[in-house]
Amino acid sequence: HKSSSQGQDRHMIRMRQLIDIVDQLKNYVNDLVPEFLPAPEDVETNCEWSAFSCFQKAQLKSANTGNNERIINVSIKKLKRKPPSTNAGRRQKHRLTCPSCDSYEKKPPKEFLERFKSLLQKMIHQHLSSRTHGSEDS
């Protein structure tokens, strides 16, 4: 099995990869269904994973305009890749006190993706900080 530090590194790679996927999708905002989606912003501490889950559950969809449909659909599906149970457990710990997905302001795809990227950056920063200070919870 992966060592703890290897796992931490892979986790960081995955989170950064999600940012790259968001950036790629931002190139195709005009090919996305212009639907308003719950987009968490200024997420309170310990509710990051809950907000992350809200972004993953959102029905971001290709407008099926043809040209970029394949890369959009592949990218959206990769954005929904489930993190491992250890992180799910951390989310569970705070689930009862975090806002529901429906309570977040709804935004069109462009702003939705920008807010998702912002959350991912925050989570990466927190993860790095927790590693620096020797904390296990990220």
């Epitope: 995955r14 990869q17 950036d23 790629q24 890749r81 491992p84």
Partner: antibody, heavy 126, light 106 residues
Framework: QVQLVESGGGVVQPGRSLRLSCAAS????????MHWVRQAPGKGLEWVAF????????YYADSVKGRFTISRDNSKNTLYLQMNSLRAEDTAVYYC???????????????????WGQGTTVTVSS | EIVLTQSPGTLSLSPGERATLSCRAS???????LAWYQQKPGQAPRLLIY???SRATGIPDRFSGSGSGTDFTLTISRLEPEDFAVYYC???????FGQGTKVEIK
């Protein structure tokens, strides 16, 4: 070691069908998306089809859409390409390739085709 | 759909020289989505670079990738005899390949 071996190529008449197979070994087949890529004689690489690790989604190049079907049997570690209504322009070496981005969060994360088979030749001729 | 245009079509160089291959995309590509492959005659392609600049496992450090947006470059710092081959760029997700650049011995 990690390996992909294609089979099923041959000479076939236009309009007929052929099924290619790709046997995978040395890795957890069910954790990886898989591709078919082809190369016509003296030409460049052309992506043909992709199937998600669990078979839940499939994508095709416009040139084969409606004629070719990609499928997989994870219990047999095997990828397939069913080719119907074959045309002369389908003549090529067909490669299966592993998608480098594993479904496992802690697995491989390469956005590219990181393992390739040796290829099998399909000739469509009357 | 995105089109990847590689240049030059053929590059004639001597061993020890530096090779610079270009790949231009018709629309912006996130760096993570750009890969480079090497193919020698009669062989399957081999992944060289993923994420525009990361070397795949076992690839020597004379190979390097760079670029962002629509312009990407593969550089071979000092050509070895085994490097003479055809090189392809590819956009991940659409899986479109460029038409290839042949690096041949001068």
């Amino acid at each position: 070691q990690v390996q992909l071996v294609e089979s099923g190529g041959g000479v076939v008449q236009p309009g007929r069908s052929l099924r290619l197979s790709c046997a995978a070994s040395g890795f957890t087949f069910s954790s990886y998306g898989m591709h078919w890529v082809r190369q016509a004689p003296g030409k460049g690489l052309e992506w043909v089809a992709f199937i998600w690790y669990d078979g839940s989604d499939k994508y095709y190049a416009d040139s084969v859409k409606g004629r070719f079907t990609i499928s997989r049997d994870n219990s047999k570690n095997t990828l397939y390409l069913q080719m119907n209504s074959l045309r002369a322009e389908d003549t090529a070496v067909y490669y299966c390739a592993r998608d480098g981005d594993s479904s496992d969060w802690y697995g491989d994360y390469y956005f590219g085709m990181d393992v390739w088979g040796q290829g099998t030749t399909v000739t469509v001729s009357s | 759909e995105i089109v990847l245009t590689q240049s030059p079509g053929t590059l004639s160089l001597s061993p020890g020289e530096r090779a610079t291959l270009s790949c231009r995309a018709s629309q912006s590509v996130s760096s993570s989505y750009l890969a480079w492959y090497q193919q020698k005659p009669g062989q399957a392609p081999r992944l060289l670079i993923y994420g525009a600049s990361s070397r795949a496992t076992g690839i020597p450090d004379r190979f390097s990738g760079s670029g962002s947006g629509t312009d990407f470059t593969l550089t071979i710092s000092r050509l070895e005899p085994e490097d003479f081959a055809v090189y392809y760029c590819q956009q991940y997700g659409s899986w479109t390949f460029g038409q290839g650049t042949k690096v041949e011995i001068k």
